[in-house]
């Protein structure tokens, strides 16, 4: 084993760790679960001990990201590089960073849980073996009704056991359909689907309609998706497999490596391949995120990597079921924080639950359960008819508006909404608006005409907010939002829209909170926003005050900027920070002077 | 002993090409991080591109990106990088360094061996 | 980018004399400081990285501290062969950026 130079360790016994995000390969809960197993490895033979938080004060910050992703040590796109680790010390050190370019799994092929069947809900085995024949992917072979399944062993033959994969024949998520499953065809703007379309919307998501007639009824649901038929690379990247597809005259119904001489799966997107030539890779074993992680806090408690092959700090991945951690690597984090105190608890045994009765559904029939359990995100809008064409990329046109004093930046007392938009600040007045990068001897660039980068908002607004997943900038002014994507727009929509009442005169700011979720301000009154569902949880409203204490109350814009929240009164700001899970003060300034760094002359 | 020897400058017209090498011996080449730096006459260091160990990530800085490529071959223990629609403003010398970081422990942060630079003047 | 601010442009000391030069980085970038020496003619030369351990081969009269946005290197006495030109190089976020350099001059 190595430590790194100085022996650097931590110098507390009870370590905390946030896990910032997700990677979408794995659910939530498999994840959470994967980091608490791989710290369970380090506190089984250490004093140590390790505490989930949820606050970036963490000791251990755990972020899934690709390529630049705020730090000084870019991810490499899909395999080479897997993830990274800091050694202990206090900000970014001890933090643990994943590349999720790669295919996250337990190292077993992608993660699908079931559900139904008979297996409680237990994930797919990929491969498994059903009559006699291998299958890489779920299946619809041995059903009439075209449901999606799996086997749970590697063996349906010998095991029967199976469950039923994410598909849209079983049900939908979020919407507002109840979760009801799609209806094929269906009707929408006239024309017929019998498949899941993102038409109509300019985020990507997939959607069908619940019932026959979409336009009629309304009525719809988002369509599950399906990692483990989600292809890679070929030409049809983020498509699914079809399965059966037509190869060279030949039927397959499962990824296949015929036509390669690498053995690499891959499978058609389309039904017929020597027609359409769509097709890309089939997924394939994925990472042990438990394995990685294991590593990865590895280095994050102070260990370097070993010169013992067998050992999990050697700098090589290498996916085992049996035990990770190496004589060497005891010794070396025992090296750092000494043995665990009491006795070594004995390996816990592990047995899987047997179900009590005989399974009474096999894939041969429909399954006999049916969905009972409601979608947990709120009501969503219908999907936003015709889609709204691409974000343009590339620099904007905006016109510079002549110059006079008031177009200073600097000499204007109080914005109308200041947001940040990609990695500047942006300040709103009066039809204008100015940009800000920070930086030694900075200054806001502008004033640029609203009317030519966002031709559709009118001169006032209340506040601007961007949500960086899918660079969506909603506008707010008055009872009025307007959603843009790149240079198409949504709206103006009625904040009714959104689920705000009546009462609601404006909105005057947004923050972050968590993937997909903001926080919208009225006045002394706050509420969560899905971004996906554009609606706000109703149950959420909440006093400003309780969430932040020592904020005004009469604040006329509240956003967020590197990662800390503003809120603006007159022309000041109060700036607030969260640690150990409480929103505190910690800073009130001016935003020329503070923010802007403009001259106090 | 580590060495890093760069080849391949010259004297080429705006708009042109050129090819830089740089052999490295001395460690084990296919494990690190390698870069490209360089430093116009009379001026400081300004990073030009950065490759991964495995070849597989590569990046630029904004001044070339679109018209330098850089990679390696870990077989012959070279790095490379081509310079096309070349400008008078890349006129520099241009040093190949090798990473302290490697694979995925981020610390060590320093270009520990440099080669000893190359001469690439655009000019008409 | 991460603007890096080396102080002073210039310095003039003699041979035995304490040099410290300052290196400030235009946001936080943790211990991710990396100081090189180079000399007319040559390639820079690693001296410190991640802030305060010196490179191998260094002499232990240079040294490195600061963190987050400040930095220093001290030479604790002065040799003829140390005058040269230093830069601070930082990692804490992408792009690396180089400071515009300290020449330590014979006074």
């Known amino acids: 084993f190595q430590t790194f130079e100085g022996d650097l360790k931590w110098h507390h016994h009870n370590i905390t760790y946030w896990i910032q995000n997700y990677s979408e390969d794995l659910p939530r809960a498999v994840i959470d679960d994967a980091f608490a197993r791989a710290f369970a490895l380090w506190s089984a033979v250490t004093p140590l001990t390790f505490t989930r938080v949820y606050s970036r004060d963490a000791d251990i910050v755990i972020q899934f990201g690709v390529a630049e992703h705020g730090d000084g040590y870019p991810f490499d796109g899909k395999d080479g590089l897997l993830a990274h680790a800091f050694p202990p010390g206090p900000g970014i050190q001890g933090d643990a960073h994943f590349d999720d370019d790669e295919l996250w799994s337990l190292g077993k092929g992608v993660v699908v849980p079931t559900r139904f069947g008979n297996a409680d809900g237990a994930a797919c085995h990929f491969p498994f073996i059903f009559e006699g024949r291998s299958y890489s992917a779920c299946t619809t072979d041995g059903r009439s009704d075209g449901l999606p399944w799996c086997s749970t062993t590697a063996n349906y033959d010998t095991d029967d056991r199976f469950g039923f994969c994410p598909s849209e024949r079983l049900y939908t998520q979020d919407g507002n359909a109840d979760g009801k499953p799609c209806q094929f065809p269906f009707i929408f703007q006239g024309q017929s689907y019998s498949a899941c379309t993102t038409d109509g919307r300019s985020d990507g998501y997939r959607w069908c309609a619940t019932t026959a007639n979409y336009d009629r009824d309304k009525l719809f649901g988002f369509c599950p998706t399906r990692a483990d038929s989600t292809v890679m690379g070929g030409n049809s990247a983020g498509e699914l497999c079809v399965f059966p597809f037509t190869f060279l005259g030949k039927e397959y119904s499962t990824c296949t490596s015929e036509g390669r001489g690498d053995g690499r799966l891959w499978c058609a997107t389309t039904s017929n391949f020597d027609s359409d030539k769509k097709w890309g890779f089939c997924p394939d074993q994925g990472y042990s995120l438990f394995l990685v992680a294991a590593h990865e806090f590895g280095h994050a408690l102070g260990l370097d990597h070993s010169s013992v092959p067998e050992a999990l700090m050697y700098p090589m991945y290498r996916f085992t079921e049996g035990p990770p951690l190496h004589k060497d690597d005891v010794n070396g984090i025992r090296h750092l924080y000494g043995p665990r105190p009491e006795p070594e608890p004995r390996p816990p045994t592990t047995t899987t639950p047997q179900p009590t009765a005989p399974p009474t559904v096999c894939p041969t029939g429909p399954p006999t359960v049916h969905p009972s359990e409601r979608p947990t995100a709120g009501p969503t809008g219908p999907p936003s008819a015709g889609p709204t064409g691409p974000p343009t990329a590339g620099p904007s046109t905006a016109t510079t508006v002549p110059l006079s004093p008031v177009d200073d930046a600097c000499n204007v007392n109080i914005f109308d909404a200041i947001a940040e938009i990609g990695n500047q600040l942006y300040l709103f007045k009066d039809g204008k608006y100015w940009r800000f990068s920070e930086g030694r001897g900075s200054r806001p660039q502008g004033p640029f005409l609203i009317a030519d980068k966002w031709p559709a908002l009118p001169r006032k607004l209340d506040s601007v907010f961007e949500e960086r997943l899918s660079k969506k900038l909603f506008f707010f002014s008055g009872r009025q939002v307007w959603v843009y994507t790149g240079a198409s727009v949504l709206g103006p929509r009625r904040l009714d829209k959104l689920g705000l009442g009546a009462d609601v005169a404006q909105v005057t700011g947004a923050l972050r909170s968590g993937r997909g979720k903001m926080l919208l301000f009225s006045g002394r009154r706050l509420w969560r926003f899905d971004v996906k569902a554009q609606m706000v949880d109703p149950r959420s409203a909440s006093e400003v005050d309780r969430m932040f204490p020592g904020v005004p109350l009469d604040t006329h814009d509240v956003f967020q900027y590197r990662e800390k929240a503003y809120f603006c009164q007159d022309r000041f700001y109060w700036r607030v920070s969260s640690r150990s899970e409480l929103n505190q003060v910690d800073q009130v300034g001016y935003v020329t002077y503070d923010i802007l760094q403009c001259p106090e002359d | 002993e580590v060495q890093l020897l760069e080849s391949g400058g010259g004297l080429v017209q705006p708009g042109g090409s050129l090819r830089l090498s740089c052999a490295a011996s001395?460690?084990?080449?296919?494990?690190?991080p390698m870069w490209w730096v360089r430093q116009a006459p009379g001026k400081g260091l300004e990073w030009v591109s950065?490759?991964?160990?495995?070849?597989?990530?590569?990046f630029y800085a904004d001044s070339v990106k679109g018209r330098f490529t850089i990679s390696r071959d870990n077989s012959k223990n070279t790095l490379y990088l081509q310079m096309n629609s070349l400008r008078a403003e890349d006129t520099a010398v241009y040093y190949c360094?090798?990473?302290?970081?490697?694979?995925?422990?981020?610390?060590?942060?320093?270009?520990?061996?440099w080669g000893q630079g190359t001469l690439v003047t655009v000019s008409s | 980018d991460i603007q890096m601010t080396q102080s002073p442009a210039t310095l003039s000391l003699s041979p035995g004399e304490r040099a410290t030069l300052s290196c400030r980085a235009s946001?936080?970038?943790?211990?991710?400081l990396a100081w090189y020496q180079q000399k007319p003619g040559q390639a820079p030369r690693l001296l410190i990285y991640d802030a305060s351990y010196r490179a191998t081969g260094i002499p232990a009269r240079f040294s490195g501290s600061g963190s987050g946005t400040d930095f220093t290197l001290t030479i604790s006495s002065l040799e003829p062969e140390d005058y040269a030109v230093y830069y601070c190089q930082q990692r804490g976020n992408w792009p690396i950026t180089f400071g515009q350099g300290t020449r330590l001059e014979i006074k």
């Open positions: 360094a090798k990473d302290r970081a490697y694979g995925d422990y981020v610390g060590w942060n320093g270009f520990d061996y």
């Open positions: 950065y490759i991964y160990p495995s070849g597989g990530g590569t």
């Open positions: 946001q936080s970038i943790s211990s991710f």
């Open positions: 001395g460690f084990t080449f296919s494990t690190y």
